[in-house]
C-alpha cells in the first residue's frame, strides 16, 4: 500500500475547518474490514483519529476530527479537523495498514489575519516641529507573529528607533504593538504596515501630522 499526502502545508484560518488530505490506492476487492488507518501527531505520537477492525474508532483529539466514511473505500483517508486552533499547528502522520503498511506526514499551518492597525500619538497636542513624538501602531488577534514595517510620507523605510513587541493571548493569537520614536518635521505622514507572513496579508495604518489638528 502506498500513502500519498500533499507536499505543501495545509493553511487553515483559526476557527475554520481544515482537511488534511491523505490517500492510498486500494487493491481490487478491497474492503473496509481490511483497513487500519491511524492519524497521529508526528512528534508526540498522540493519537488523533483511527479506523481499525472495520470501524471508525472516533476522535481521540478533543472530539474535533472526522474521517470521510463514504470515501474510505475509494482510498480517501483524509482527516477533517474542525474549529482549528493555534495549538493544532504541526505535523500529522497518516498511517495506513492493509496487507502491508505505509505512512506520510502532512503539515498544518494555522493562521489568523491581523486587524486594521490603530495609531496613537504621544504627546498628542501642542506639537511643534523638532518635538520628539512616539507613534504607536497596534494590531490584534493575528497568527503567526507579524512583520512590522514603518515608512514616511515619501515611502522611505523608517528603521531606527522602532520597538516592536508581540504578545500571545490565551488563544495563542498575537497582539502586536510597534512604537516609532521620531523628531517631527514641519508636517509628515507616518505609516505602519503589519504583515501576516503566512497569509501574505498586509494591514495598514497611518497618521498625518500637519500641525493641528491631527488626522489618523
Amino acid at each position: 500500500v502506498e500513502v500519498q499526502v500533499s507536499e505543501d502545508p495545509v493553511v487553515a484560518l483559526v476557527d475554520t475547518d481544515a482537511t488534511l488530505r491523505c490517500s492510498f490506492s486500494p487493491e481490487p476487492g478491497f474492503s473496509l474490514a481490511q483497513l487500519n488507518l491511524i492519524w497521529q501527531l508526528t512528534d508526540t505520537k498522540q493519537l488523533v483519529h483511527s479506523f481499525t477492525e472495520g470501524r471508525d474508532q472516533g476522535s481521540a483529539y478533543s472530539n474535533r476530527t472526522a474521517l470521510f466514511p463514504d470515501l474510505l473505500v475509494q482510498g480517501n483517508a483524509s482527516l477533517r479537523l474542525q474549529r482549528v486552533r493555534v495549538t493544532d499547528e504541526g505535523s500529522y502522520t497518516c498511517f495506513v495498514s492493509i496487507q502491508d503498511f505505509d505512512s506520510a506526514a502532512v503539515s498544518l499551518q494555522v493562521a489568523a489575519p491581523y486587524s486594521k492597525p490603530s495609531m496613537t500619538l504621544e504627546p498628542n497636542k501642542d506639537l511643534r516641529p523638532g518635538n520628539m513624538v512616539t507613534i504607536t501602531c497596534s494590531s490584534y488577534q493575528g497568527y503567526p507573529e507579524a512583520e512590522v514595517f514603518w515608512k514616511d510620507g515619501q515611502g522611505v523605510p523608517l528603521t531606527g528607533n522602532v520597538t516592536t513587541s508581540q504578545m500571545a493571548n490565551e488563544r495563542g493569537l498575537f497582539d502586536v504593538h510597534s512604537v516609532l520614536r521620531v523628531v517631527l518635521g514641519a508636517n509628515g505622514t507616518y505609516s505602519c504596515l503589519v504583515r501576516n507572513p503566512v497569509l501574505q496579508q498586509d494591514a495598514h495604518g497611518s497618521v498625518t501630522i500637519t500641525g493641528q489638528p491631527l488626522t489618523f
Epitope: 500500500v1 487500519n36 491511524i38 498511517f95 496487507q99 502491508d100 503498511f101 505505509d102
Partner: antibody, heavy 119, light 109 residues
Framework: QVQLVQSGAEVKKPGSSVKVSCKAS????????ISWVRQAPGQGLEWMGG????????NYAQKFQGRVTITADKSTSTAYMELSSLRAEDTAVYYC????????????WGQGTLVTVSA | EIVLTQSPATLSLSPGERATLSCRAS??????LAWYQQKPGQAPRLLIY???NRATGIPARFSGSGSGTDFTLTISSLEPEDFAVYYC???????????FGGGTKVEIK
C-alpha cells in the same frame, strides 16, 4: 546492506529483568516493523511482540502481556526488548527481526542474544 | 488465536529426493503465510512469503502453495544444505502479530 546487531549474552537471576538492544543499519529505521522472537533451547520460534517505530505503537503476544516492553529510539535506530520477572523458562535466544519496507513479515534477523536465567 | 500445526515433525530423506512439508491453520489465514528455514546456531531465513512467493535469493527448488487453512512447502530436489528445520508462520493484520508453527525437521536418512 541491512544489518541488525544485538547486544551480548546475559546471565540473570530469577525475578530480575533483562533489556536486549537491537541496532539497525541500512534503510530508514522508522519505516520498518521490528519483531522480537525467542527460541528456548531445542524448541521452536515464539513471537513475543513488535513495534512500528514511526507510530511508536508496540503490541505483544498475549503470553507476554504485562511482562514485556518493546521500545524504539529513532535517534539511534535502536529497538529494545525488556522482559521482567524472569524465570528459568525464559532461558532462550532472543532475536530481533525486521520486515522489508512497509512489511510486517520479518526478513532480516539479528544474530540473537542468549539470555540465561539461573539462580 | 490462530494455531499452526506442522507435519510431519521429522522428515527423513536423502539428497535428491522431494520434500513435502505441511502446515495447517486452525482458521483461515488467507494467503498470509510464510516459510522459514533455520540451521543450528543460525537465525531463521525467510524462504516463502504470501504462501507462494519466493524471497530474494531463494533457489527455485523451493516452492509454496495453498490458501485458507492448508499450505505446503515443497523442496523439489534436496541439496545437502537444505537439511534444517522449517517453520511456517502466519501474520494477523491488526494489531500486527505473528504466529509460528512447531517446525518440521528435515534430516538426512
Amino acid at each position: 546492506q541491512v544489518q541488525l546487531v544485538q547486544s551480548g549474552a546475559e546471565v540473570k537471576k530469577p525475578g530480575s529483568s533483562v533489556k536486549v538492544s537491537c541496532k539497525a543499519s541500512g534503510g530508514t529505521f522508522s519505516s520498518y516493523a521490528i519483531s522480537w522472537v525467542r527460541q528456548a533451547p531445542g524448541q521452536g520460534l515464539e513471537w513475543m511482540g513488535g513495534i512500528i517505530p514511526i507510530l511508536g505503537i508496540a503490541n505483544y503476544a498475549q503470553k507476554f502481556q504485562g511482562r514485556v516492553t518493546i521500545t524504539a529510539d529513532k535517534s539511534t535506530s535502536t529497538a529494545y526488548m525488556e522482559l521482567s520477572s524472569l524465570r528459568a523458562e525464559d532461558t532462550a535466544v532472543y532475536y530481533c527481526a525486521r520486515g522489508g519496507s512497509g512489511r510486517y513479515l520479518p526478513d532480516y534477523w539479528g544474530q540473537g542474544t542468549l539470555v540465561t536465567v539461573s539462580a | 488465536e490462530i494455531v499452526l500445526t506442522q507435519s510431519p515433525a521429522t522428515l527423513s530423506l536423502s539428497p535428491g529426493e522431494r520434500a513435502t512439508l505441511s502446515c495447517r491453520a486452525s482458521q483461515s489465514v488467507s494467503s498470509y503465510l510464510a516459510w522459514y528455514q533455520q540451521k543450528p546456531g543460525q537465525a531463521p531465513r525467510l524462504l516463502i512469503y504470501d504462501a507462494s512467493n519466493r524471497a530474494t535469493g531463494i533457489p527455485a527448488r523451493f516452492s509454496g502453495s495453498g490458501s485458507g487453512t492448508d499450505f505446503t512447502l515443497t523442496i523439489s530436489s534436496l541439496e545437502p544444505e537444505d537439511f534444517a528445520v522449517y517453520y511456517c508462520q502466519q501474520r494477523s493484520n491488526w494489531p500486527p502479530s505473528l504466529t509460528f508453527g512447531g517446525g518440521t525437521k528435515v534430516e538426512i536418512k
